[in-house]
């Protein structure tokens, strides 16, 4: 059975995640969870330097 990569590296993703495509990687607790448990990252306001909490790495396959 062909196994493709688990996730493709997006421009903002530093590395592939260990999650299957059905899940998302929680950067806060550093493991895979259902994507609905994460908050989507919000656009940073001008001058903001800290990342939004609980963002996910899960580029489209």
């Amino acid at each position: 059975m062909r196994r493709g990569p688990r996730s493709l590296r997006g421009r903002d993703a530093p590395a592939p995640t260990p999650c299957v495509p059905a899940e998302c990687f929680d950067l806060l607790v550093r493991h895979c969870v259902a994507c609905g448990l994460l908050r989507a990252p919000r656009p940073k306001p001008a001058g903001a330097s800290s990342p939004a909490p609980r963002t996910a790495l899960q580029p489209q396959e």
Partner: antibody, heavy 118, light 113 residues
């Protein structure tokens, strides 16, 4: 070819226990999440939970409806994973399926039937 | 838990007809970070186990005929069979995997006239 074969079903009395098995072939067992789903006769499907892959430490998620009574585990050396069911009730009577999780529930076994009755 | 509601519960159509069935979720299944809807469709033929047809609401699983199309976003989803064949006799289930516990709809039973 991906193949999932469930076994271990049968008749059990209320309050009893049963362990279902899912034998896996056709893919690297440690690299996939594996799930259990059940279907009471003539009714809809119910997700019971899954166990993640090696990269995720074989962690588990459960449906609250069975959490505490049902336990999912795996024996990677034999390419088998299990559903341990305790304190069984009449409403646990169903066909139990194992399924490989990737994009969703990608591949399913043929199912094994559990009947809980006195 | 997210409640999945399917309609109609059953329908009977002739071979060659177009069929649409609906699935509604009690909350949005769209994850805005990647614009994926975490919704799948399964086909369960009589006496068989379910088979994945569609994932991410609209992506056809490998080997699934192109007469099956999934569409929709957020809370409203549709499975369309463009030209029904006799072999499509089955119950069709939608399922959300946006959050735990994963939940299924009650199914739509497709009968052939």
């Amino acid at each position: 070819e991906v193949k999932l074969v469930e076994s271990g079903g049968g008749l059990v009395q209320p309050g009893g226990s049963l362990r279902l098995s899912c034998a896996i072939s056709g893919f690297t067992v440690t690299a996939y999440y594996m799930s259990w789903v059940r279907q009471p006769p003539g009714k809809a499907l119910e997700w019971l939970g899954f166990i993640r892959d090696k990269a995720n430490g074989y962690t588990t998620e459960y449906n609250p409806s069975v959490k505490g009574r049902f336990t999912i585990s795996r024996d990677n050396s034999q390419s088998i994973f299990y559903l341990q069911m305790n304190t069984l009730r009449a409403e646990d009577s169903a066909t139990y399926y194992c399924a490989q999780v990737r994009r969703a529930l990608d591949y399913w076994g043929q199912g094994t039937t559990v009947t809980v009755s006195a | 838990d997210i409640v999945m509601s399917q309609s109609p519960s059953s329908l009977a159509v002739s071979v060659g007809e177009k069929v649409t069935m609906s699935c509604k979720s009690s909350q949005s299944l769209l994850y805005s970070s990647n614009q994926n809807n975490y919704l799948a469709w399964y086909q369960q033929k009589p006496g068989q186990s379910p088979k994945l047809l569609i994932y991410w609401a609209s992506t056809r699983e490998s080997g699934v005929p192109d007469r099956f199309t999934g569409s929709g976003s957020g809370t409203d989803f549709t499975l369309t069979i463009s030209s029904v064949k006799a072999e499509d006799l089955a119950v069709y289930y939608c399922q959300q995997y946006y959050t735990y516990p994963y939940t299924f709809g009650g199914g739509t039973k497709l009968e052939i006239k």
